[in-house]
Interface confidence: medium
Amino acid sequence: LSEEADDTDSELGSMKPLHTFCAMKADDGPCKAMIRSYFFNMYTHQCEEFIYGGCEGNENRFDTLEECKKTCIPGYEKTAVKAASGAERPDFCFLEEDPGLCRGYMKRYLYNNQTKQCERFVYGGCLGNRNNFETLDECKKICENPVHSPSPVNEVQMSDYVTDGNTVTDRSTVNNIVVPQSPKVPRRRDYRGRPWCLQPADSGLCKASERRFYYNSATGKCHRFNYTGCGGNNNNFTTRRRCLRSCKTGLIKNKSKGVVK
């Protein structure tokens, strides 16, 4: 099965990918696992999320958004990376709370993108993701009150693309982190539509495999996912067009940043 281009996508651009496999369509493979992965979309020239079945597929599949961008976007590392001191919030500030696998009780802090504040949470002690700070001050300094730099006109600043919690490195290096800049990606806080359009794709609780679409507020697009037939949430549409009609209207057109496509 392959991810199709969005209804609203333009024709295939002239940008040449770094590798031939970056031009392949997303292939979720024949297996039935539901693994959040990323692929490079030749039509949008962006790395986007898709659901991988767990076996076969092709090389246009990455565990993290960052890995996809580094591999498939020409010049990404040279031109799209700048230090956190001069950037907006690092991407890990927008990762969901992840207490990890263990059952310890460690008081930690994370940035909550809904409330725009750093909040306390209980960390189990192992694994998890980098939205995990030992002190409230550290969390605030990195995610709540980052140093802003002026952004070019007609460019939407990167502030909220969803990444996989697997890309974790030592917390002590957080002040030296390089932050990817991804133009043309609307931020979640620029969204004023229906609240369920901000919810992550939820495959539900049953065992069916139904093709559905969910709105990804990070990319401003509707993506396909497999729905198991029961449970889940309201960010679940039978067609991409319905999904776009329901959720795309909530994007704010911001004068200082240009029109969000």
């Epitope: 539901m34 992840d98 696998l101 263990c102 059952r103 002690g125 192992c126 995990n132 974790v168």
Partner: antibody, heavy 117, light 110 residues
Framework: QVQLVESGGGLVQPGGSLRLSCAAS????????MTWVRQAPGKGLEWVSA????????YYADSVKGRFTISRDNSKNTLYLQMNSLRAEDTAVYYC??????????WGQGTLVTVSS | DIALTQPASVSGSPGQSITISCTGT?????????VSWYQQHPGKAPKLMIY???SRPSGVSNRFSGSKSGNTASLTISGLQAEDEADYYC?????????FGGGTKLTVLG
């Protein structure tokens, strides 16, 4: 009794793919995080990947990130490890283990993966 | 990231006590009860001997005990027996990894 049985190992050429399975029995599979650990011939143990009980989060060692994919099917009490772009240094016995809060209290017997041309 | 260092080998005679150390390079090891120990006989799967620094799973002999002081965890085996000859691994974790020490080969002399 509580048991884990791995399968799917074998000989594969560099760059090839292999899918390991781990069948669990004797315990409530969907209540436990699960882990893959490997051991190269004559070497020590190396953690490879872990997955939460409901499959919602997955974790990988740097050495396999982007090449290996862990998944599980709780309806079948089975854990999987899809290994792509295999390298000679991936040659090892692969164990699946039950992850009880960061330690591994139940282990399978292991399955040997040999990557060689 | 956390890294764990063990001695390559230790030895002892039957009836003696031996201690295997496991030193962490990260403060995580010193600040949290994160250490477990595994025994592995040649050709066999590892077996959990100690978890949460000093807890013993059911079925493991009380000759095995664990402790921790600062950044160093220790496994002590008292009343050494021939069947204790095996490789022993310490293991811990942090935000990024579940980590094993390099392993210690225990030889029971005589």
């Amino acid at each position: 009794q509580v048991q884990l049985v791995e399968s799917g190992g074998g000989l594969v050429q560099p760059g090839g793919s292999l899918r390991l399975s781990c069948a669990a029995s004797g315990f409530t599979f969907n209540s436990y995080a699960m882990t893959w650990v490997r051991q190269a011939p004559g070497k020590g143990l190396e953690w490879v990947s872990a997955i939460k009980s409901d499959g919602s989060n997955t974790y990988y060692a740097d050495s396999v990130k982007g090449r290996f994919t862990i998944s599980r099917d709780n309806s079948k009490n089975t854990l999987y490890l899809q290994m792509n772009s295999l390298r000679a240094e991936d040659t090892a016995v692969y164990y699946c283990a039950r992850n009880d809060s960061g330690w591994f209290d139940v282990w399978g017997q292991g399955t040997l993966v040999t990557v060689s041309s | 990231d956390i890294a764990l260092t063990q001695p390559a080998s230790v030895s002892g005679s039957p009836g003696q006590s031996i201690t295997i150390s496991c030193t962490g390079t990260s403060s995580d090891l010193g600040g949290f009860n994160t250490v477990s120990w595994y025994q592995q006989h040649p050709g066999k799967a590892p077996k959990l001997m100690i978890y949460s620094v000093s807890s013993r799973p059911s079925g493991v002999s009380n000759r095995f005990s664990g402790s921790k002081s600062g950044n160093t965890a220790s496994l002590t085996i008292s009343g050494l027996q021939a069947e204790d000859e095996a490789d022993y691994y310490c293991q811990s974790y942090d935000l990024n990894n579940l980590v094993f020490g390099g392993g210690t080969k225990l030889t029971v002399l005589g």
